[in-house]
Each structure stands twice: as C-alpha cells, then as structure tokens.
Amino acid sequence: ANSMLEETKQGNLERECIEELCNKEEAREVFENDPETDYFYPKYLVCLRSFQSGLFTAARQSTDAYPDLRSCVNAIPDQCSPLPCNEDGYMSCKDGKASFTCTCKPGWQGEKCEFDINECKDPSNINGGCSQICDNTPGSYHCSCKSGFVMLSNKKDCKDVDECSLKPNMCGTAVCKNIPGDFECECPEGYRYNLKSKSCEDVDECSENMCAQLCVNYPGGYTCYCDGKKGFKLAQDQKSCEAVSVCLPLNLDTKYELLYLAEQFAGVVLYLKFRLPEISRFSAEFDFRTYDSQGVILYAESIDHSAWLLIALRGGKIEVQLKNEHTSKITTGGDIINNGLWNMVSVEELEHSISIKIAKEAVMDINKPGPLFKPENGLLETKVYFAGFPRKVESELIKPINPRLDGCIRSWNLMKQGASGIKEIIQEKQNKHCLVTVEKGSYYPGSGIAEFHIDYNNGSNAEGWHINVTLNIRPSMGTGVMLALVSSNNTVPFAVSLVDSTSEKSQDIVISVENTVIYRIQALSLCSNQRSHLEFRVNRNNLELLTPLKIETISQEELQTQLAILDKAMKGKVATYLGGLPDVPFSATPVNAFYNGCMEVNINGVELDLDEAISKHNDIRAHSCPSVWKKTKNS
C-alpha cells in the first residue's frame, strides 16, 4: 500500500510540478504534509533555475548530476539521492519523510557512517587485544610487533627474536647480548662499540671534560690530576680539584726594617756605593740574626777592586778577611752568634786597626798599616754588597766560603750614614723583608724545590746503592712531595709525599715508585707544633721503615716488581729534590704538590744544608722556619 501511495505521489508530482510549474501550495497538495513540502520546494526552485532557458548560474552547478528538469525534480523527494552516507562506511541508505537512515558497516559509526570506530581505544578490549602495537585502520584495525619481535599465529601476540643466535658475528669482536626486542654489542668499561669497525674502541673520557683540571686517558679508563704546583689536590670524587688547605697556620709577618739576606739563592741582595769625603773611614754597624753557620754578611771593596773587606760567618762565628796594597789578613773570633737571637755587630776602621765588636764588646782587633781603601777625587769611594759577592771572587779570597746566608739584619749604619734612602727602597720590596719571628730549621713555602746531586752508590756494600733517610717535619699544608728522586728520563723512581688523609685532620705519608704507592703510613696528626720524625732505609731488595708506625703496603710480589724499577733507575743518574718535583709529567707520581712547612733532611748520615744545593727556589729558607701562628685575643 505504501508503494502504491508513492506511485500516486510521483504521478501527481509529474503532473503538477514538471509538466506545469507549481507554487508551494500546489506542491503541498502533492505531498499532503509540511515537512516534505518545506524540504521539496526550495530544491524545486533550484531545479527550475537550473533548467529554465538553459541558464547556467551558480545554482545550476548543484544539479549537474541531472540531465533534465524531470530527473532533477524527481530526485528531490528521495532522501538517499544524492547519497548522504559516507561511501566507505555505509552498508545501506533508507529514504524517509524528509529524512534518511544510513546503516553502517562494522567498524563505522555516526549518522552518515562517517566516523571510524578506533578499536585500539576500546575500553572493553584494551589495545584491541594486541600485545604490542595496535594499528587502527578505517573501519578496522590490526596488531603489529615492535622491531626485534615476530607476530604469533593468533595475530595478536609477539615473541622476541634472539638476534645473537640468528647472526653469531653480529657484534664482531664485541660481546653480543640479546635484550627484549633488540640486541646490544657490549664492550668492557671504558670502551665504546664502533658500528663501522664492529669492534670496541677506547673512550677518550678526557675529551668529554670528565676532569676539572688535568686528565690522562689510557685504554679502558682515565685518571684525573690536579695541578699541585698551583696548590690543588684531587677531591674525594676523583674528578674535581680543591685547594690544598693550610693545616697549621704560620706567622709569616714580615717587617721592612729587617733586611732578608737570603732573598737571592745566588747573588747579592743589596748593593751600595758610597762616595764620601776622603776623611771618611770604613764602618759597618748592624744587628744580625741567623741560625745559619756559614755565609757572607757583607763584602766591601774599592772602586777598582784592588782592596776589599769581607765580613762573614763561619762555624757560627764572625770572620773578617781583608786585602789591600799593604796587607792580607783573615781572623775569626768571638762567640757563636748563629743562635737565632739579635746580635749587635760593628766593624770599624780605626787609624791603625780594624775593630770588630759584638754587643759593643771588642772581640777582634786587626792591625793594618794604612787606610783600608784609598781615596780618589777627594772622595772615599766604597762599594758594599750584602749577602754575596759581585762576581767570582773565590780565587781572591784568603779562605773560600759558601756565600749563601739565611739571616736578617736590622738597624744598619754603613759608613756612618745611617739607613737613609735605603730603608724606603726596602719598604717597597716585600720579598726582601724578614720574618719577625723564626725558629731553627728549613722552610719550604709550597712554591719551589731544592736540588741536590747525591751519590747513593756504596762500593763497599754488597747491596750496591742504598738510601737511608731521616725526615724531621712540621707541615703547614697536608699535601706535598717532601723528597723525590728524579731520573734523567723525567720519571720519578722514588718519592716520599704527604697527603691529606680521608680521616679528619690527619695526614698519610705515601712512598711511591713512579706512580705506584708502595707504602702508606695512615692517619698521622702531623700538622702540630711538634715535629714528626720519619726514618726509613731502601735498597734494591727491601724498604724498611724504622719509625714504628701503622703501615699499609702492597703485596711482596708487587713490592719486588717496584723495587726492580727503582733499582734500574738507581743504576743510572738520579737527582734528589726536596720540597717538590721539577717539571715532570703530572702523571709521573701520585702527588705533585709542593711541600709547605718546615723540614730537615738527613740522607745517608749527612744533614742536607740547603745552602749547598745545586739550585734552590729563592723562597725556600735554608736555616729559618716561621713560628706557628699563636691565636691572640684580637685575632
């Protein structure tokens, strides 16, 4: 019945609106309801405009599918023409009264079946039931596997592929390790796998800035170093550097009124030339303080060098040597004055003698036939050199002397001219000032070394070479090289160093051969007022510590290997350094910082005198050690 009604409506539509033109009222009579009429009539007008008198307007374009007016109008009432449903997603379209119904294929939804159902996000079937990857596709989905896995027959689950078994040479020289979905070519620590060469290559950690200061890369690893010479040491993390800190503060106060005689290791500290009226005679008065036993206090000479006078110290006593056209004399006398106290010394040329006084008491009188220095130009011209000689004068001296003298003078009055003009010059030069208080000993300021050439070979000893060392130390900083033997090839076959201990406020003493620690004396409280004593013996077979201390040592086998390295070095040339190392590679020893503090060294029964060194840093004090800083109420 319904289809019959449709046919009637179709006939009426043909008659009323195609063969003739109909208005909206007439169209309503055809459809007998408003919704269909309201739907039909505007579209009808579009058909008319399109096919009337062949006009092609903008409206016409929507009716292009129809060849003529009839087909255009006849299609209007059919809601499924043109097809409103999404072609990919619909199964069928059902026409209704001014409406349509799209029936969707599985996997589609929406009024027009335009929306794909994402099965991968279905809460009732998580990930679409896939074990790894769920790929949604229009109207469907499928499961897939990650790289390194294969799909099982159920098309949902995945299984790992063991690449190492499939291709045994996958990693070349590296070790192949299967991991879920992949494989890894494993290299030992410190190596990195190279895909191209299929081999393990050393990682240059140094190029990756692993270390704060200095870095040495080696196969499979690296070591960080800190520039000890600039006062740094390696921190606990073995990467960063920290300043070597003071563990025992010293009183380094100086006074410009005190002239330091040892400011130069070799050479004159202060040179003066006087041109005084000819009535003048030579005179020198000064206060003098030293613990040194030998050295030049001052050397005076005439302009032409023909006459000279030497005031020196030998065996702790004042010595005067003089030479001019009339005479040549040497005299030593008075009490020992290298006692660290201020001693007033005066040397005065009188008419017929030279008078030497200590503390205003005459200790020597040297007869002289004529004036010490001959006047010229109506002037007495005299050159005075403090703490050294102006040139090589050894051959001229009556008795040779080591000129180096670690001492101080104050309140000087030369040629009865006072200290005028000189005092203010000295005031400006900080390094020429003397410490206010000193003690007996040698002081290493942590900025230089002293070099000695010592023969360790003992012909009468079956052991060949031997090193017997006694160290008396009072460190001011907890890290530094105290004693080192350095070969001509810049290796350090033997070193005794101090390092800050891991335990609070204590230090370790380490004995090393090249860069291997062979002995470690642990956790000593060395930074104290008291001096510490360390004694040991080394020969080709053994290292013996004579001071009863707790030791940590390497195995006997390893010790023999290291002693063999030392033995080889001792058969060649070695230089002995105190207070640090010369310019050797920083990786040559476990410690490279300079020693800071006081230290006396005895090697093979001989007390080393820093004045006898081959070379010595100017700042090392051979015979004076700063006192420990005493806290006052104000400090």
Epitope: V268, L270, Y271, L272, K273, F274, R275, L276, P277, N377, G378, L379, Q417, G418, S420, G421, I422, E424, I425, I426, K429, K432
Partner: antibody, heavy 129, light 107 residues
Framework: EVQVVESGGGLVQPGGSLRLSCAAS????????MSWVRQAPGKGLEWVAN????????YYVDSVKGRFTISRDNAKNSLYLQMNGLRAEDTALYYC??????????????????????WGQGTTVTVSA | DIQMTQSPSSLSASVRDRVTINCRAS??????LNWYQQKPGKAPKLLIY???SLQGGVPSRFSGSGSGTDFTLTISSLQPEDFATYYC?????????FGQGTKVEIK
C-alpha cells in the same frame, strides 16, 4: 785639594753675552755631573743648569732655556756656561758646583742620591744698561 | 717642576737651643732631599743628603728626617757658628729646585 774656581763674570748690557768658566782641581771632572747655581743679590739659591759626566745630557731651568748653554771639556778639567741674550734678572753671583752621587743603591733597580758637595766662591754677573 | 717651600723664612734662637726647620715638596720626592748651610759671603755647604744622611765632617748635632713631601732639619744644640741661612734642595728630578731659605739669627 779638591776645589772649583769660577771666572768670566763681569758687567754686560742687556742682550749681551758672557762665557763663564769653572776650573776643577784635585779631582777628575769626567767622573761627576756638574751644575751652575746662581744667587741674585739678597735672594736665595737658584739652580741654573747641569751636565752629565760625558756631556751627553744637559738640563736647564725654564727661565734660561734657549739662551744659556752648559758645556764641558773633560780634557781641560773645565766646565762652561755660555750666556746669550742676557737680561737684568740674570744679575747674580754664579756658582759652579760638583754634583756627587754620594749614595747609589741597587735593589732590583738603581737609586742614586746626589748632593752638591763641592762649590766654588762664585763669579758675579751684572746685567745693566 | 717641583716646588720646595721652607718654613719659617727666618727664626731667632739662642745658643744651645733646639732648632727645627721644615721643608715641603709639591709632590713626593721620596728621600731625595739635601740640606745646605750658607754663611754670608760664602758658598753653600752640603750638610745632609738623602734626607737624613750626614755628610762627612758635619757635626752630629745636625740631623735630618722625613720622606715623601715633608722634611725637617734639626740642630739639637745651636752653636755660635750655626747662625746662617739653610736651604733644602730636591735631587729627585731636573730641574733641581731649592727652597727659598730659612735664616737663623741670634736672639
């Protein structure tokens, strides 16, 4: 005996010239800087010029620059002051003086302390119309 | 040029008096200062060089002190032969310059 003796002073008209001489004895001139110092009647001392031992350096007070010339003849042990374009204000007693580096110190640098330790009795220069 | 200023320009004192003469430089001359004594009709005589060093043959009652810009000449016990005019002079740079002088007269 160490001494210096000046000569060559006299009366001269403004704009005129004079040459003063200083003869040294008892010392060799070539070892010392030498100076001329003048003293106007009833006034204080005024340094005029000086010359280095070998004559390589010469210095003058601004008021005489371009008019006076200091020179020396070490072979003759003599010092000179050539004065041209004389003015009334140049009237003074002119002294020749030895400048001695009484103390020289070397202490990373050279420091020399000079003093005029030998003076002549002076020669009088009068500039008047 | 460095100006040298002396004070006082004159002073009266008695024998055995302690006399002090001051000299000030317009800039620091360190210790490059000399003192001279001049008696009427005589040439000047060097007393002290380098601010405090006594020239040979000069009595020890004369002493000098100071450095930088301020200097002092002291006669510890004035003697009859010390009545004269005293001049300071800098040897720090050229032109050498003198102070205007201090006349020490008998009171």
């Amino acid at each position: 005996e160490v001494q210096v003796v000046e000569s060559g002073g006299g009366l001269v008209q403004p704009g005129g010239s004079l040459r003063l001489s200083c003869a040294a004895s008892g010392f060799t001139l070539n070892s010392f800087w030498m100076s001329w110092v003048r003293q106007a009647p009833g006034k204080g001392l005024e340094w005029v010029a000086n010359i280095k031992e070998d004559g390589s350096e010469k210095y003058y007070v601004d008021s005489v620059k371009g008019r006076f010339t200091i020179s020396r003849d070490n072979a003759k042990n003599s010092l000179y002051l050539q004065m041209n374009g004389l003015r009334a204000e140049d009237t003074a007693l002119y002294y020749c003086a030895r400048e001695t580096d009484i103390l020289t110190a070397y202490y990373s640098d050279y420091y020399s302390y000079y003093g005029m330790d030998v003076w002549g009795q002076g020669t009088t220069v009068t500039v008047s119309a | 040029d460095i100006q040298m200023t002396q004070s006082p320009s004159s002073l009266s004192a008695s024998v055995r008096d302690r006399v002090t003469i001051n000299c000030r430089a317009s800039q620091s001359i360190r210790s490059y200062l000399n003192w001279y004594q001049q008696k009427p009709g005589k040439a000047p005589k060097l007393l002290i060089y380098a601010a405090s060093s006594l020239q040979g043959g000069v009595p020890s009652r004369f002493s000098g002190s100071g450095s930088g810009t301020d200097f002092t000449l002291t006669i510890s016990s004035l003697q009859p032969e010390d009545f004269a005019t005293y001049y300071c002079q800098q040897s720090y740079s050229t032109p050498r310059t003198f102070g205007q002088g201090t006349k020490v007269e008998i009171k």
